[in-house]
Interface confidence: low
């Protein structure tokens, strides 16, 4: 039955948060948990965290990176505390499904 | 990142209703188990039950039916109902969000029962 | 479940190696939680399952064991580290706690 409860749940892990977003935090719990790059006003921002709704994720951790922005996901215990996500470099591109590690 | 902020009655006489209320911030509802967890001055730590986001509940069998516990999904909060409450029921009343542990904790609420 | 948690307080020197045990009434599958509870706060969870630490938890804290036997660790007592420590199991329901293990500086 969906509704009884797990003694883990599979779907939610712990994830690294850095950020704006992650408020006085180092770490939040999601269905995924990513690394991101944007750049603001020329300004290289890299956050880190958690999508706690798995569609969410599912959106974000698709879209390919682009030349202002990059979000490499991942699904395991602290997965993203060593992934830096980078910018695709000039004359390289990078496909959406090798944007999504799975561990 | 997920906050809790929860409020209700600090003074309560032997008999009357415990009510507290916890408001869940920048967290999703369906991602959580929701607990209620109390600590008696200079004492332990009790789980009292849960609730998920479909309002299905657990409760600690040590409290019997004295306790509801309930969702409201559209403001973002869950509530505490402890009835007929005695001086044994003082105590620091925390709301919690978990899976697999007690991961965001409320401020607590400090409930004294006395007539 | 009883989560039986021993000593109930201890005193110790800054710089020593502190260690709490925590025994369950029965196998637990690992399934043990270890939390920071400083005077006036709410508890803080340190160690998710047995050995597991959150991030910007100091590596002096460990965990191990497991079935039913279960021990936190300090490795070199801090003046920061003055706090009640209780593990707590989720194998089944009720949730339960240990009793608590008040940790304090010897003078």
């Known amino acids: 039955m969906e509704d009884e409860k797990p003694k883990v749940n599979p779907k939610l892990y712990m994830c690294v948060c850095e950020g704006l977003s992650c408020g006085n935090e180092d770490h939040c719990e999601g269905q995924q948990c990513f690394s991101s790059l944007s750049i603001n006003d020329g300004f290289h921002v890299y956050q880190k965290g958690c999508f706690q709704v798995y569609e969410q994720g599912k959106m974000t951790c698709k879209t390919p990176p682009s030349p202002g922005q990059a979000v490499e996901c991942c699904q395991g215990d602290w997965c993203n505390r060593n992934i830096t996500a980078q910018l695709p470099t000039k004359g390289k591109s990078f496909p959406g499904t090798q944007n999504f590690h799975l561990e | 990142q997920v906050q809790l902020q929860q409020w209700g009655a600090g003074l309560l006489k032997p008999s009357e209703t415990l009510s507290l209320t916890c408001a869940v911030y920048?967290?999703?509802?369906?991602?959580?188990?929701w607990s209620w967890i109390r600590q008696p001055p200079g004492k332990g730590l009790e789980w009292l039950g849960e609730?998920?986001?479909?309002?299905?509940?657990n409760n600690n069998p040590s409290l019997a039916s004295r306790v509801t516990i309930s969702v409201d999904t559209s403001k973002s909060q869950f509530s505490l109902r402890l009835t007929s409450v005695t001086a044994a029921d003082t105590a620091t009343y925390y709301c919690?969000?978990?899976?697999?542990?007690?991961?965001?904790w409320g401020q607590g609420t400090r409930v004294t029962v006395s007539s | 479940i009883q989560m039986t948690q021993s000593p109930s307080s201890l005193s110790a020197s800054v710089g020593d190696r502190v260690t709490i045990t925590c025994q369950a009434s029965?196998?637990?599958?690992?399934?043990l939680n270890w939390y920071q509870q400083k005077p006036g706060q709410a508890p803080n969870l340190l160690i998710y399952?047995?050995?597991n630490l959150l991030p910007g938890v100091p590596s002096r804290f460990s965990g191990s064991g497991s079935g039913t036997d279960f021990s936190f660790t300090i490795s070199s007592l801090q003046p920061e580290d003055i706090a009640t420590y209780y593990c707590?199991?989720?194998?089944?329901?009720?949730?339960?706690f240990g009793g608590g293990t008040t940790v304090a500086i010897r003078r």
């Open positions: 609730i998920n986001h479909r309002g299905r509940t």
């Open positions: 707590q199991h989720y194998d089944d329901l009720p949730l339960t």
């Open positions: 920048n967290g999703s509802f369906s991602s959580f188990y």
């Open positions: 919690t969000a978990h899976t697999r542990g007690f991961l965001y």
């Open positions: 029965q196998d637990i599958n690992n399934y």
């Open positions: 399952d047995v050995f």
